[in-house]
Amino acid sequence: SPCPQAWGPPGVQYGQPGRPVMLCCPGVSAGTPVSWFRDGDSRLLQGPDSGLGHRLVLAQVDSPDEGTYVCQTLDGVSGGMVTLKLGFPPARPEVSCQAVDYENFSCTWSPGQVSGLPTRYLTSYRKKTLPGAESQRESPSTGPWPCPQDPLEASRCVVHGAEFWSEYRINVTEVNPLGASTSLLDVRLQSILRPDPPQGLRVESVPGYPRRLRASWTYPASWPSQPHFLLKFRLQYRPAQHPAWSTVEPAGLEEVITDAVAGLPHAVRVSARDFLDAGTWSTWSPEAWGTPSTGTIPKEIPAWGQLHTQPEVEPQVDSPAPPRPSLQPHPRLLDHRDSV
C-alpha cells in the first residue's frame, strides 16, 4: 500500500483539529490520480487533476471533517475508503511509583491530557549508575528492561527483584497515531516504601484487669515472609465517643494497654513502617474494638472446695508484659544497611 499505516486500527487515518491533514487513498499505487468524495455524498471534494495524485489535502480540519472518505480512480473504480479521526498527540503521562515491600515496586500512570485516540504505553526501567565509570562498558545488569504491565490493572507496571539501595529510572512513553511523549521518573525503593497496614488486628480484654486491653496483629501479607528488614509499629487507641487518640510504639506484634477506661469499648488501630525509617508509615489498619474486662480475678481454690474471689485492685506497678515474639533483624544485613 502507498499509505503507511499509523499505529491503530486499519483503514483509519488521523489528524489534529485546526491543522492540515493529508489523506491517502489505500487501494491505488503512489501518484495515481484519484477523485475524492465524502462517503454517501456525491459532491466532488478533490478532482484527479489536483496534482496531488492519490492524496487528499484538507486545509484545516475540525470535528465536522471526521468521518469516511472514498477515493476513485479515473475509470470510476473504487480505490478504497479512509476514515478520518481527529485527536491530539500525547502529552507527557503523569507517573508515580509505590512500594509495599523492599523487593518490588509498581508504577502507575495517567495521560497528561486526553488525546481522544487509540493509545498504548511503553514502559521500561534501568538501574541508574554512579558517575565515573568512563573506562568500563555499561554492565548489562543495569538494563534497560521492560517494566511488565499488569494484565489485571491497566496503567500499572511492576518491577520485581529491585535492589533496596539502588536508584532506578522509569520510562513511560505514551504512544498514539499522532506521536509519542515520554515521562521519566527516578525512584529509590527506600524513599517510596510504604508498607501495607498490619493485618489481623485483635483486641482482647485481660480477665480481671478492668483497665487493660491486649492488642495483637500480624505483618501485612505483602511483606516478605522471612524478612531481612523488619517493620516497626505505631498503635493508637481511644475510648468510644472520645475524640483524641493515644499513641504508643509497641516493641513487637502485641501491646498491652494499661490505661483503658473501665467499662467502655475502645477503638484500636495500627500502622507499620520500615524499622529503620525508610519511606513512610502505612495507612492505618481497620479499627478493631474491645472492652476491658469487668470481672474479677479468680483466686486459688481452697482444699474444702469453697470458691473465694477478691475484687481486682489495679496494681500501681504493672506486671510484666507477656514475652514479645522474636523478630530480630539479621545482624549481617543490619551491618550492611548501616554501612550505606
Epitope: 508515580s96 534501568r126 558517575p131 529510572r169 520510562n171 521519566l184 521518573l185
Partner: antibody
C-alpha cells in the same frame, strides 16, 4: 568502553553553518541526557545546549538561542548540533557530554556531565 | 545566565590544602543541590570530580571534597599533589530553559 566521539568541526565563514555530530558507544544512549559545552581558546567552559533522552525537551544558552539546534537520533546513538549564523565569538572547541540527570515527578534537572568527548574545533573566520 | 564566580587562581605547596569557592544566586547554586566540579588539564577534556555538591564519582581520590552554604559552593583539595595542577570549574543547574551554567574557572598551581 564508554565513549563519545565528536566530528564535523572546521573552518567556516561568519554567517555560515556547520553541523557537529557526536557518536556514542558503550552505553544505552537513549536513556541519557546529553549536552554540548564549548571552550574558546584560552577561555573557560561555556554551557551551550542540552537535550532530554527522548529528544522532547531542549535547552540553550542565551548566546546561541535561535541560532543553534540540538537534536539526537537514538537509533544511531548520535547527538547533533546544527549551528547557523555563526559569529567569530562562536570559535571554540566543542565538547559533547553525557549526563545521567535527575527526574522527579514534576521535572528533570541537569546533574553533572560524567563522560566527555575529546572535542572538535570550530573556527569562524573570514 | 551569568557565569558563576570563582577566584581566578589558587595555590598551595604539596601536602597542603586549597579551597576554591563558587558563588552564584538562589536561582542556581543556592536553589538546587545539583552543583558539580570539573578538573581540566591543558589540552584535555574536563573530568568530573564532584557531583550533587558532595558526591565523588568512582575513581576520584577522597582528597577532593565538596560542600555548599547558601549561594556559595566550595571545592577543597587536601594533600595537594603535583598532578592536581589544573583548571577547576564549578557548574550548577540553572533553573531556567533546562540549562546549566559554569563557573569562571580557577587555575590551581602547586608550588615548589
Amino acid at each position: 568502553e564508554v565513549q563519545l566521539l565528536e566530528s564535523g568541526g572546521g573552518l567556516v565563514q561568519p554567517g555560515g553553518s556547520l553541523r557537529l555530530s557526536c557518536a556514542a558507544s558503550g552505553f544505552t544512549f537513549s536513556w541519557y541526557f546529553m549536552g554540548w559545552v564549548r571552550q574558546a581558546p584560552g577561555k573557560g567552559l561555556e554551557w551551550v545546549s542540552y537535550i532530554y533522552p527522548s529528544g522532547g525537551s531542549t535547552g540553550y544558552a542565551d548566546s546561541v538561542k535561535g541560532r543553534f539546534t540540538i537534536s539526537r537520533d537514538n537509533s544511531k546513538n548520535t547527538l547533533y548540533l546544527q549551528m547557523h549564523s555563526l559569529r567569530a565569538e562562536d570559535t571554540a572547541v566543542y565538547y559533547c557530554a553525557r549526563d545521567e540527570g535527575y527526574c522527579s515527578s514534576t521535572s528533570c534537572y541537569f546533574d553533572a556531565f560524567d563522560i566527555w568527548g575529546q572535542g572538535t574545533m570550530v573556527t569562524v573566520s573570514s | 545566565q551569568s557565569a558563576l564566580t570563582q577566584p581566578p587562581s589558587a595555590s598551595g605547596s604539596p601536602g597542603q590544602s586549597v579551597a576554591i569557592s563558587c558563588t552564584g544566586t538562589s536561582s542556581d547554586v543556592g536553589g538546587y543541590n545539583f552543583v558539580s566540579w570539573y578538573q581540566q588539564h591543558p589540552g584535555k577534556a574536563p573530568k568530573l570530580l564532584i557531583y550533587e555538591v558532595t558526591k565523588r564519582p568512582s575513581g576520584v581520590p577522597d582528597r577532593f571534597s565538596g560542600s555548599k552554604a547558601g549561594n556559595t559552593a566550595s571545592l577543597t583539595v587536601s594533600g595537594l599533589q603535583a598532578e592536581d595542577e589544573a583548571d577547576y570549574y564549578c557548574s550548577s543547574y540553572g533553573g531556567s530553559n533546562n540549562a546549566g551554567v559554569f563557573g569562571t574557572g580557577t587555575k590551581v598551581t602547586v608550588l615548589g
